[in-house]
């Protein structure tokens, strides 16, 4: 399809090279409060454009994105040649930064209803640069946690090295969704809730004496409760003796509940404890069982493949340790009878 | 408790302006969006318009823009509400409603209302 | 913008009976959807958020429920208290937009 019809924009994505960060681009026009609708074209010099949905009562979700070749090839479907790049509905997520993304990216309802519906389109020309200046030591992560119940604000990243006075106005976006009353480059939140989690975009616009751009930033926002006070607590085994049978295979399961942290950093082992001498046990990898705000329970099991008589006078420990503390559980095999 | 106090009744003549406030006590003032919301006699709901006044940031309905003016004085956590060019058409009762949840935050839903100001326009 | 269109625009029941009111939006708005108690004479309460959230200190013989452009409102044994005008209204996006109304009125 012919795409000079197009509406176009441009915009910048400047990214750290220090951390791993995303960005999306929307497929929306110019202005963020008409993203439902496209202008169509003229039918006649005297008729006024009127403004028609692009997708009926679909509401945009069913777009096609292109990927137009800088050497002039026909254009890519991005769901094609592009594994880092992922449509949700009309927002195009980029998982990986890289100058590699650079380029002119177009969107166009999947559904051409009728033939003036052809320049129903973005045309959004992106520009990729890893951020070269050091002047601005501490600008805001693209991974900002907010703890629960207090005050917090998310940064504009772009934006964080200039005073509320000297920014320019900022349009933010949640998880999508245009915040129409969020201009200024700090959103302050004066009380946590976990409502306020989620992927939040800012863009501000700068301009040359040729032309301008929109500069996108793009912040996971994660709502958390405050670092534990508590050393992890064993939840099973909770006896420290058990039957079991000789010759027979056995599994002895450690689970474990670790409060939150946010530097996380769990430690569950088994280790052997017999007579005078103590080791490790290599045994599978530990894996998460349930996650929530507040605390993840962990679990680890040792496996003999066959119990022995000497595993009998052999105390099997399991270890847990955060960065309050530790603690430990020891079991004793005893040998069922009859 | 949580309340929206709004200006007494108004009487004003085509072409007028009218400003009606609404004070807000019981909760932290700038941590949520205030909505104006009108309703003329015998009719529906009509949403006028947003304001953020932590920032003083608006968003206008079409239908308004050019004509209502939303500010706010963080010092009395009182909003206020400017239609100017006033027609018999804006006849109607004007009411101020606090957004439900904490900013920033997409419309939850208006959980609390002023109890509304009438506004009477008449040669 | 958005257009909300509820029916039926007025009702007669009874008390203790179940009464359902539906709204239709116009393009799909998730869940980003309100309902709203009016009184004559009083301000609107708001009775649903979120298309199915009960607002706290309403009455659990009222729920919600839809997603995308079909909602309802329903009241499961109406109350002589219940008498009123209901409205729907999307959070979607600005402008946020009510439907005409739903009068329930005693049989």
């Known amino acids: 399809f012919n795409i000079s019809g197009c509406s176009t924009k441009k915009l910048l994505w400047t990214y750290s090279t220090r951390s791993e960060e995303e960005f999306v681009l929307f497929c929306d026009l110019p202005e963020p409060q008409k993203s439902h609708f496209c202008h169509r074209n003229r039918l006649s010099p005297k008729q006024v454009p009127e403004h028609l949905p692009f997708m009926g009562s679909n509401d945009l979700s069913d777009v096609q994105w292109y990927q137009q070749p800088s050497n002039g090839d026909p254009l890519e479907d991005i769901r094609k040649s592009y594994p880092h790049i992922i449509q949700d509905k009309c927002t195009l997520h980029f998982l990986t930064p890289g100058v590699n993304n650079s380029g002119s990216y177009i969107c166009r309802p999947k559904m051409i209803k009728s033939p003036y519906d052809v320049a129903c389109c973005v045309k959004m020309i992106l520009e990729v640069k890893p951020q070269t200046n050091a002047s601005c030591e501490y600008s805001a992560s693209h991974k900002q946690d907010l703890l629960l119940g207090s005050t917090g604000s998310i940064s504009c990243p772009s934006l964080s090295c200039q005073s509320d006075a000297q920014s320019p106005a900022v349009t933010w976006y949640k998880n999508g969704k245009l915040l129409s009353v969020e201009r200024s480059n700090r959103i302050v939140v004066d009380e946590v809730y976990d409502y306020h989690q989620g992927t939040y975009v800012c863009d501000y616009t700068q301009s040359d004496t040729v032309s301008s751009w929109t500069v996108r930033a793009v912040v996971q926002v994660r709502t958390i409760v405050g670092d534990t006070k508590l050393k992890p607590d064993i939840l099973d085994p909770v006896e420290d003796t058990l039957e079991v049978e000789l010759g027979k295979p056995l599994t002895i399961s450690c689970k474990a509940r670790f409060g939150f942290e946010r530097v996380f950093n769990p430690v569950i082992k088994w280790y052997i404890k017999d007579s005078d001498l103590e080791w490790e046990v290599s045994v599978p990898e530990a894996k998460s069982i349930k996650s929530t705000l507040k605390d993840e329970i962990i679990e680890r099991n040792i496996i003999l493949e066959k119990v022995t008589q000497r595993d009998l006078r052999r105390k099997f420990v399991c270890f847990v340790q955060n960065s309050i503390g530790n603690t430990t559980q020891s079991v004793q095999l005893k040998e069922k009878r009859g | 408790q949580v309340q929206l106090v709004q200006s007494g009744a108004e009487v004003k003549k085509p072409g007028a302006s009218v400003r009606v406030s609404c004070k807000a006590s019981g909760y932290t003032f700038t941590s949520y969006y205030m909505h104006w919301v009108r309703q003329a006699p015998g009719q529906g709901l009509e949403w006028m318009g947003i304001?953020?006044?932590?920032?003083?940031?608006?968003t206008y309905a079409q239908k308004f823009q050019g004509r209502v003016t939303m500010t706010r004085d963080t010092s009395t956590s009182t909003v206020y509400m400017e239609l100017s060019s006033l027609r018999s058409e804006d006849t109607a009762v004007y009411y101020c409603a606090k957004e439900g949840r904490v900013s920033p935050t997409d419309y939850y839903g208006m959980d609390v209302w002023g109890q509304g100001t009438t506004v009477t326009v008449s040669s | 913008d958005i257009r909300m269109t509820q029916s039926p625009s007025s009702l007669s029941a009874s008390v203790g009976d179940r009464v359902t009111i539906t709204c239709r939006a116009s393009?799909?708005?998730?869940?980003?959807l309100n309902w709203y108690q009016q009184k004559p004479g009083k301000a609107p309460k708001l009775l649903i958020y979120?298309?199915?959230s009960l607002q706290s200190g309403v009455p659990s013989r009222f729920s919600g429920s839809g997603s995308g452009t079909d909602f309802t409102l329903t009241m499961s044994s109406l109350q002589p208290e219940d008498f009123a005008t209901y409205y729907c209204q999307q959070s979607y996006s600005t402008p946020l937009t009510f439907g005409g109304g739903t009068k329930v009125e005693i049989k």
């Open positions: 304001i953020n006044p932590r920032g003083g940031y608006t």
């Open positions: 393009q799909s708005i998730s869940s980003y």
């Open positions: 979120d298309a199915s």
